[in-house]
């Protein structure tokens, strides 16, 4: 008799793929023209990335450092109207993209939480949660919670409101902290909170260190659902050496949890790479005309248009990974086991019951390395075969679908491999 199938875990929508942050509507859409109506026209692009949720804003009225002139219920007219927002929600729903609204109050000011008037701001946030939940948003994000006095109890209250409305709603909190103890204490009081932090960016970017960061995080957070990013708001290029961008995309998409990206991460957008670019919100490079002020400043391979036409581009890799992440059971909710491999490498396996299994091998080093996979520290349920098929490599030159002998596996500098192999009873 065939072995019984393992019962599937309850899956919320944010478990099924990546979240995509658009913190600055105008920068995302291009020079000075960004509003909610225009964003509606970019939903097809987001669909092509197979992201499950859009983390949007803040969009509310906020006069820098002035509580009285901050209204979490009013959309800043520069971004559009409430009607535009409602239309965006409807269009996003039709494309199965969830919308998460950033309600960080003083987003234009110094202290994002108006440190002197925390209680009145917290009441405003409570009211705003109820208002926007009724408007149809799928969740909320609040950032810089390390600057919010008594953050844990406020977050617990806000999560109660959010989950009280529907278990299908999500609360995301962001912190600049990279301290694991601080992160865990924030998570402890909130069972379903998704927390983005700078934890992974406080790294020496070696295989060994990354492996220890990931395993420590997973051990400390127990069996709760995690999110993976390098910061609460910034671009990957602001935290990573350029040569590791592809490697990190592969890792973020294949770790157990929800990957969270910022607009432009999929094309390797750089903060302030071009003259006059604001550091915090660089203009999205849709095509070569995205920077009309400086002819020739943007080459095709930096843009969405150029990378869409190149199967070897970062954008193509992102799309491939996002597609795998959203449809393969082992990547959606599979078990995770790391195991020993050569120095400079980080290797792990994802598996779920009798479904196809995935092996991820990441070479963080500057030199080519033999994988040296040692499966002895894997449990019996996750043993390695002698061969696995290549799903993708972060570097050109390998043939997708080709079987690779794991004992002889060699990786190029900064190469990451995603391999698949079947369950064998």
């Amino acid at each position: 008799r065939a072995p019984r199938c393992r019962e599937l875990p309850a899956q919320k929508w944010w478990h099924t793929g990546a979240l995509y942050r658009i913190g600055d509507l105008q920068a995302f859409q291009g020079h000075g023209s960004g509003n909610l109506a225009g964003l509606k026209g970019r939903l097809d692009y987001l669909s092509s990335l197979k992201v499950k949720g859009l983390v949007l804003g803040p969009l509310h009225k906020n006069q820098k450092d002035d509580v009285a002139q901050t209204d979490l219920l009013q959309i800043d007219p520069n971004f559009g109207s409430k009607e535009d927002f409602d239309n965006l929600l409807q269009s996003a729903k039709k494309k199965s993209i969830r919308v998460i609204l950033d309600l960080t109050p003083n987003y234009r000011g110094e202290n994002l939480w108006f440190s002197t008037q925390v209680d009145s701001v917290a009441t405003k946030v409570k009211d705003a949660l109820e208002f926007w939940l009724q408007a149809g948003v799928d969740g909320f994000q609040v950032r810089d919670i390390e600057n919010l006095k008594d953050a844990s109890s406020f977050l617990a209250e806000w999560e109660n409101i959010t989950k009280g409305f529907s278990e299908d709603r999500l609360l995301i909190a962001g912190t600049n902290s990279s301290d694991l103890q601080q992160i865990v204490s924030l998570l402890e009081s909130n069972k379903d909170l998704l927390l983005t932090s700078s934890y992974l960016s406080d790294s020496s970017f070696t295989g060994e260190h990354t492996k220890s960061l990931v395993t420590q995080y997973l051990n400390a957070t127990g069996n709760r659902w995690c999110s993976w990013s390098l910061s609460q708001a910034g671009l990957l290029t602001s935290f990573l050496p350029a040569q590791l961008l592809r490697l990190y995309q592969l890792m973020l998409f294949t770790l157990p949890g929800t990957p969270v990206f910022s607009y432009g991460d999929e094309i390797g957008l750089k903060a302030a790479a071009l003259p006059g670019q604001p550091v915090e919100a660089p203009v999205m490079l849709w095509d070569e005309s995205s920077f009309p002020d400086i002819p020739g400043a943007v080459s095709a391979n930096m843009t969405v248009k150029g990378q869409s036409e190149d199967p070897g581009s970062l954008l193509s890799l992102f799309r491939q990974l996002s597609d795998q992440r959203s449809k393969e059971r082992s990547l959606l909710h599979g078990d995770f086991h790391t195991f020993s491999s050569g120095p400079g490498l980080f290797s792990y396996i994802r598996h779920w019951d009798q479904n196809e299994r995935f092996l991820v091998v990441l070479n963080f080093g500057d030199v080519g390395l033999s994988a040296g996979l040692q499966a002895s520290d894997l449990p019996a349920s996750a043993s390695l075969p002698t061969k696995a098929d290549l799903v993708l490599s972060t570097q050109p030159g390998r043939e997708e679908g080709s079987p690779l002998e794991l004992e002889r596996l060699k990786l190029e500098p900064h190469e990451g491999l995603l391999l698949r192999f079947p369950y064998v009873a």
Epitope: D71, L73, K126, D127, E130, F131, Q134
Partner: nanobody, 125 residues
Framework: QVQLVESGGGLVQAGGSLRLSCAAS????????MGWFRQAPGKEREFVAT????????YYADSVKGRFTISRDNAKNTVYLQMNSLKPEDTAVYFC??????????????????WGQGTQVTVSS
């Protein structure tokens, strides 16, 4: 149960002012989001303004923004609608409504479980 009784309506010249009141009895008033809606003859009921249970947050329809002010006095179990610079198109029956599930009411009338009988406001030109 919540009972709501509106008052303060009447006939007023364009440019004039009125203050509507809505007295609530029954369930704890201070935990309800409260709203005002209106219905002109031959038209659907439309949202005017809403206020959170503490009175901290308010939201208005674009058509009344800057002219109408919603407020509440939880000690008196009453919500108010101050209407200034009235226009003929503000002519309608004005209804007060209570949302017992949310501290912050919304713009759609289905969220409100309890309604008053309405008070007529007529603005002549």
């Amino acid at each position: 149960q919540v009972q709501l009784v509106e008052s303060g309506g009447g006939l007023v010249q364009a440019g004039g002012s009125l203050r509507l009141s809505c007295a609530a009895s029954g369930r704890a008033f201070s935990s309800n989001g409260m709203g005002w809606f209106r219905q002109a003859p031959g038209k659907e009921r439309e949202f005017v303004a809403t206020i959170s249970c503490s009175g901290t947050s308010t939201y208005y329809a674009d058509s009344v923004k800057g002219r109408f002010t919603i407020s509440r006095d939880n000690a008196k179990n009453t919500v108010y609608l101050q209407m200034n610079s009235l226009k003929p198109e503000d002519t309608a029956v004005y209804f007060c409504a209570a949302d017992t599930r949310h501290c912050m009411g919304y713009t759609k009338d289905e969220g409100y479980a309890y309604w008053g009988q309405g008070t007529q406001v007529t603005v002549s030109s």
